[in-house]
């Protein structure tokens, strides 16, 4: 069962949200829903794994309710009719607080983890492979919905029909209710690996806004900077690294380094003092030749939030900023699995790192 590489995340989707799950649900698929429960309005929210966009066929309805002391309802809807509710009388969510909600699809059940602790298992009532859509509604603001597939032995790349020269995008920041499949880079099957999401919210006073929802304050600590973490299994074709954060108002420079031992295999260095995005490699403390060309204007802006998506392919890294392909960087260090450390430093505040 060789699954393709993971679907690109939906970033800051507006609620209510419906989005396609590319390839449908598969045994071993992990879906992470990251957001904040709104404190002001409503007493419920729901995450639904469903067939199509109508909402008549929901394989798994996960529905926290801030009523009667708080409880969570799990259910299935078939042809518009709800089955018997399964209730969990513990409420792991808090109004006004962020949460990390992970769903693992397995052959017999959905497992649900909330804030790092297994919360509930829900045994399938209908075949899960019918599910092709995730929807979220109710009193919640979303930061992202991400997908992580299981992977097996490498095979020849199954290249997509999208030519590499075309710009490819993250899912758009949704304005409407329904999301069609996003245009993404081709993703290749790869060895089994582990995605690690390192999540903390931005610091006091930092806002993260979307077109459809007013900015919200996140009074939570930022990542310690510089931020250093291991990339489990190193790089390989189809490996993705996702970072988001905010450029400090007085920023001069920041950097994202992918390292192999003492070498910097990939140095991504936005420089506001030079209005440039510099890329380079450092081997044995010696820098190579810089790459600076961009297809459009400098995408990073002082004081503004950003997302960076780095996709490793056989011959190069592809880098997208704010959902738009920006450049390719051909590997100078070609022993990809040894590139196993991410270092981020400089004049930014990180809000999310997924390796």
């Amino acid at each position: 069962m060789a699954f393709s590489g993971s679907q690109a995340p939906y970033l800051s989707p507006a609620v209510p949200f419906s989005g396609t799950i590319q390839g449908g649900l598969q045994d071993g698929l992990q879906i992470t829903v990251n957001g904040t429960v709104l404190s002001s309005s409503g007493t419920r929210f729901a995450v639904n794994f469903q067939t199509g966009f109508s909402g008549n066929d929901i394989a798994f309805h996960f529905n926290p309710r801030f009523e009667d002391g708080g409880y969570v309802v799990c259910n299935t809807r078939q042809n518009g009719s709800w089955g018997p509710e399964e209730r969990k009388t513990h409420m792991p969510f808090q109004k006004g607080m962020p949460f990390d909600l992970c769903f693992l699809v397995q052959s017999s059940d959905f497992k649900v983890m909330v804030n790092g602790i297994l919360f509930v298992q829900y045994f399938h009532r209908v075949p899960f492979h019918r599910v092709d859509t995730i929807s979220v509604n109710g009193s919640v603001q979303l930061s992202y919905i991400s997908f992580q597939n299981p992977r097996t032995v490498p095979v020849q790349p199954a290249f997509s029909t999208v030519p590499f020269s075309q710009p490819v995008c993250f899912p758009p920041r949704p304005r409407g209710r329904r999301q069609k499949p996003p245009g993404v880079w081709p993703a290749n099957p790869a060895p089994i690996t582990q995605t690690v999401i390192h999540t903390v919210q931005s610091a006091p006073g930092q806002m993260f806004s979307t077109p459809a929802i007013p900015p919200m304050m996140y009074p939570h600590p930022a990542y310690p900077m510089p931020f250093i973490t291991t990339i489990l299994g190193g790089l390989y074709p189809s490996k993705s690294i996702l970072l988001s954060g905010t450029v400090l108002p007085s920023a001069q420079r920041f950097h994202i380094n992918l390292c192999s031992g003492n070498h910097i295999a990939f140095h991504l260095n936005p420089r506001f003092d030079e209005n440039a995005v510099v890329r380079n490699t450092q081997i044995d403390n010696s820098w190579g030749s810089e790459e600076r060309s961009l297809p459009r204007k400098m995408p990073f802006v002082r004081g503004q939030s950003f997302s960076v998506w780095i996709l490793c392919e056989a011959h190069c890294l592809k880098v997208a900023v704010d959902g738009q392909h920006l450049f390719e960087y051909y590997h100078r260090l070609r022993n990809l699995p040894t590139i196993n450390r991410l270092e981020v430093g400089g004049d930014i505040q990180l809000t999310h790192v997924q390796t």
Epitope: M97, K111, N115, G116, I117, L118, Q194, V196, H198, V200
Partner: antibody
């Protein structure tokens, strides 16, 4: 190398307070949940509290609820256990432990060496 | 609260013996069970996570299994360094999201 180092234990009178620290290195506490587990002399392990720093989510054992507060300072990469209204039965070695950072892996993979808290008059 | 009832509380065995320790959860905890080894004056060490997965660096003579709400730690051939106390632990969200078993002390016969 991942390491957890507890500090702050000692002798305190009943009704008193102590703050335990758990300094982490080799990983960021923001990417894990951190748990405090205690062990009274000659007894078994008792879970005390946990924090998931990203969502400021925390939970406590019934025996310490309302008296103990767990927190984390991600800039210092340190977790804390503030213990108030201490009782003789709180006497124990207190361990901090990291719950595995890998999703769907259930287990505390790194532990500190422990710090002894003695509540006695 | 979810209770983890561990048995036996102690056992005596010889080097080379096969040793089995069980934990029964008072309700379903899926596979969210770990096993630890603790020696006097030391912190616990993770042996088995997610009910049946061997933690890195742990000898293969240790194994874990699950049958419904019953969880078993097996040491296939007891070694001198295995004399210690063993604990099971569940992490399934309840009023107390983490609970430990009472422990099993494995002593030399």
């Amino acid at each position: 190398e991942v390491q957890l180092v507890e500090s702050g234990g000692g002798l305190v009178q009943p009704g008193g307070s102590l703050r335990l620290s758990c300094a982490a290195s080799g990983f960021t506490v923001s990417s894990s949940s951190i748990h405090w587990v205690r062990q009274a002399p000659g007894k078994g392990l008792e879970w005390v509290a946990y924090i998931y720093p990203y969502s400021s989510s925390s939970s406590y054992a019934d025996s310490v609820k309302g008296r103990f507060t767990i927190s984390a300072d991600t800039s210092k990469n340190t977790a804390y256990l503030q213990m108030n209204s201490l009782r003789a039965e709180d006497t124990a070695v207190y361990y901090c432990a990291r719950y595995s950072t890998y999703k769907w892996v259930w287990g505390m993979d790194y532990w500190g060496q422990g710090t002894l808290v003695t509540v006695s008059s | 609260d979810i209770q983890m009832t561990q048995s036996p509380s102690s056992l005596s065995a010889s080097v080379g013996d096969r040793v089995t320790i069980t934990c029964r959860a008072s309700q379903s905890v899926s596979s969210a069970v770990a096993w630890y080894q603790q020696k006097p004056g030391k912190a616990p060490k993770l042996l088995i996570y997610s009910a049946s997965s061997l933690y890195s660096g742990v000898p293969s003579r240790f194994s874990g299994s699950r049958s419904g709400t019953d969880f078993t730690l097996t040491i296939s051939s007891l070694q001198p360094e295995d004399f210690a106390t063993y604990y099971c632990q569940q992490s399934y969200y309840d009023s107390n999201p983490i609970t430990f078993g009472q422990g099993t002390k494995v002593e030399i016969k």
